[in-house]
Amino acid sequence: MNGRVDYLVTEEEINLTRGPSGLGFNIVGGTDQQYVSNDSGIYVSRIKENGAAALDGRLQEGDKILSVNGQDLKNLLHQDAVDLFRNAGYAVSLRVQHRLQVQNGPIGHRGEGDPSGIPIFMVLVPVFALTMVAAWAFMRYRQQL
C-alpha cells in the first residue's frame, strides 16, 4: 500500500463583503498553534452555513490564507490573526492557497506526499487521447488500402 498522494496547488484572490454575521468562517494556525507540522500558516477550519464565505462559494475548508487586504499572515500569533480578520473592514480581500489532493496508486492510502507533484491524470489523459487519435488514423489508413 505505497501509493503516493499528490497535491495540485493553486492560488486565488477572493473578495468578500462582510455579511450581517461577519465573514462566516473559522481559522486554525499561527506561530503558537501549529495545525500543520512545520507550518505556522493560517488555515480555514470551518465555513459557516449561510455566512458570507459560504454564499460566495470559493473559500474552502483546508485552504491556507496567505494575506488579508494585502497584509501577510506569516509569523503571526493565532489571536493576532483572528484580530486582523475582525478589524479588516467591510470589504475583505483574501489571498488563498487551495490544495487539491489527488490520489495516486492503491486506493485507501492517505499519507503525506510531495505537495509539488504533478497529478498523474494530467499525464494520462493526454497520452490516452493521443493513443485514441493514432488508432483512429491507423484504421482510416487501412480502409484506404
Partner: nanobody, 127 residues
Framework: QVQLVESGGGLVQAGGSLRLSCAAS????????MAWFRQAPGKEREFVAD????????YYADSVKGRFTISRDNAKNTVYLQMNSLKPEDTAVYYC?????????????????????WGQGTQVTVS
C-alpha cells in the same frame, strides 16, 4: 470525528457545588473553541460558557456569571465547568460542545450552530 463525553453531573442541594468534565478525543483538541450549554425540560438549549483554544479568553451567560467557571487542560483533552452557589433554576442537562478553530467574526457565543460537535449530556439536578 471528535467524540465528547461529559461526566460529573448529579443531585445537589441548593447552594452546593459540582464540577463537570468533558473529555474529548482527537489530537487537535487544543485548536477547538469549547463551550457548555444546558437544556431544562421544555426549554430551548441555552448557552452557559465558552473558552478559547488556549484558555486565554472566556465568556459567560449573565445567569451564571460569578458562580460558574469554565477552564480547560489541553494536555488532558478536557474542559471543565466548576459550578458554585447552585440554584434550582440551574437544573438541566448540561452539554459540552466543540467548534473547530476560532471564529474570525465578533462572537455569537449563544448560537448552537457555531459548534460542530456535541456530547450526550449529563444531568444536573438542584433541589
Amino acid at each position: 470525528q471528535v467524540q465528547l463525553v461529559e461526566s460529573g453531573g448529579g443531585l445537589v442541594q441548593a447552594g452546593g457545588s459540582l464540577r463537570l468534565s468533558c473529555a474529548a478525543s482527537g489530537r487537535t483538541f487544543s485548536t477547538y473553541t469549547m463551550a457548555w450549554f444546558r437544556q431544562a425540560p421544555g426549554k430551548e438549549r441555552e448557552f452557559v460558557a465558552d473558552i478559547n483554544w488556549n484558555g486565554g479568553s472566556t465568556y459567560y451567560a449573565d445567569s451564571v456569571k460569578g458562580r460558574f467557571t469554565i477552564s480547560r487542560d489541553n494536555a488532558k483533552n478536557t474542559v471543565y465547568l466548576q459550578m458554585n452557589s447552585l440554584k434550582p433554576e440551574d437544573t438541566a442537562v448540561y452539554y459540552c460542545a466543540a467548534a473547530i478553530g476560532s471564529t474570525v467574526d465578533s462572537y455569537y457565543h449563544s448560537d448552537p450552530l457555531e459548534y460542530d460537535y456535541w456530547g450526550q449530556g449529563t444531568q444536573v439536578t438542584v433541589s
